[in-house]
Amino acid sequence: CDLPQTHSLGNRRALILLAQMGRISHFSCLKDRHDFGFPEEEFDGHQFQKAQAISVLHEMIQQTFNLFSTEDSSAAWEQSLLEKFSTELYQQLNDLEACVIQEVGVEETPLMNEDSILAVRKYFQRITLYLTEKKYSPCAWEVVRAEIMRSLSFSTNLQKRLRRKD
């Protein structure tokens, strides 16, 4: 499956929108920094078959979409930017879903992939727990926004590597 060129453009647009969503000075939030344990090894792309990589990417985007679709998220961010961001993510999910269906027919996805998807889910559970503990404060959301920008950048890089493999 070849992800359309519009997919990588959508990726970039999502990152730009996320960057624009910042509301408060980041400098005031240093004390709220937190180690969410991003599962970097799941995004290095070396040990993956393409079907695995695509399903891990899908999980990453799905969880990001879920995180920014909550009521708490709606209260934290400027509505029009949030809607545009969610729309970009939704389009990426559609692209990836089409690929997942196509690729899984081509190669069996080993159980190892379930571990990778679980690692991504646990990562987002840690983010959600952090937000809850911090009572969804503006700084907590700033820290999460920075973290998601970083993890989406990893996703973008993995997608670039997948395209180079084609």
């Epitope: 980041h26 939030c29 240093l30 920094r33 950048s153």
Partner: antibody, heavy 121, light 107 residues
Framework: EVQLVQSGAEVKKPGESLKISCKGS????????IGWVRQMPGKGLEWMGI????????AYSPSFQGQVTISADKSISTAYLQWSSLKASDTAMYYC??????????????WGQGTLVTVSS | DIQMTQSPSSLSASVGDRVTITCRAS??????LNWYQQKPGKAPKLLIY???SLQSGVPSRFSGSGSGTDFTLTISSLQPEDFATYYC?????????FGQGTKVEIK
């Protein structure tokens, strides 16, 4: 390879202006903040201020507020430190270093080689 | 501003010695503390971040510990290349502040 390359040594007279630079390469420049640190001859490290190149938001140490200006041009991945009127006491080595911002990653993990500024009449 | 106080300001030691440098913050900084090494004429080099995390490429003889206000940098077995000045730095709030430095000299 991540690199921060600073502009060369400067010799200036008191009252003159100066702008030194720090060019980042090998990483996404807007994903990291750039901090500036002063080291006067034979002395320790003093944190001056920081900039987020993504939106040019800046913060200064009270000791340096109003004395220097920090700026950045993200189109050329470069941060700047400038003085409008130098004093002899500004004679020092100035370092830039990158900071991961609100991300959990090593602070100030890469440093420039330093720019020696000498102010003398 | 948060004040950082290092001790000792200098020490003499021999190759193979275990060396300990302490850093005290004027208020709690949780684990937001970094340690740097600086050699004459060179830029500082990050050794330890978040109080105890070893920076990539730094030898395992360096270790950091502590939280709150009291922190320690330990060199388990001093090597010739370790003779330098060491600085702690708080990273919890702006302005970031450094300790005054500890110079490790050859005995």
């Amino acid at each position: 390879e991540v690199q921060l390359v600073q502009s060369g040594a400067e010799v200036k007279k008191p009252g003159e202006s100066l702008k030194i630079s720090c060019k980042g390469s090998g990483y996404s420049f807007t994903s990291y903040w750039i901090g500036w640190v002063r080291q006067m001859p034979g002395k320790g490290l003093e944190w001056m201020g920081i900039i987020d190149p993504s939106d040019s938001d800046t913060a200064y140490s009270p000791s340096f507020q109003g004395q220097v200006t920090i700026s950045a041009d993200k189109s050329i991945s470069t941060a700047y430190l400038q003085w409008s009127s130098l004093k002899a006491s500004d004679t020092a080595m100035y370092y830039c270093a990158r900071h991961p911002g609100l991300n959990w990653a090593p602070d100030f993990d890469y440093w420039g080689q330093g720019t020696l500024v000498t102010v003398s009449s | 501003d948060i004040q950082m106080t290092q001790s000792p300001s200098s020490l003499s030691a021999s190759v193979g010695d275990r060396v300990t440098i302490t850093c005290r913050a004027s208020q709690s900084i949780n684990r937001f503390l970094n340690w740097y090494q600086q050699k004459p004429g060179k830029a500082p080099k990050l050794l330890i971040y978040a109080a105890s995390s070893l920076q990539s490429g730094v030898p395992s003889r360096f270790s950091g510990s502590g939280s709150g206000t009291d922190f320690t940098l330990t060199i388990s077995s001093l090597q010739p290349e370790d003779f330098a000045t060491y600085y702690c730095q708080q990273a919890i709030d702006l302005p970031f502040t450094f300790g005054q430095g500890t110079k490790v000299e050859i005995k």
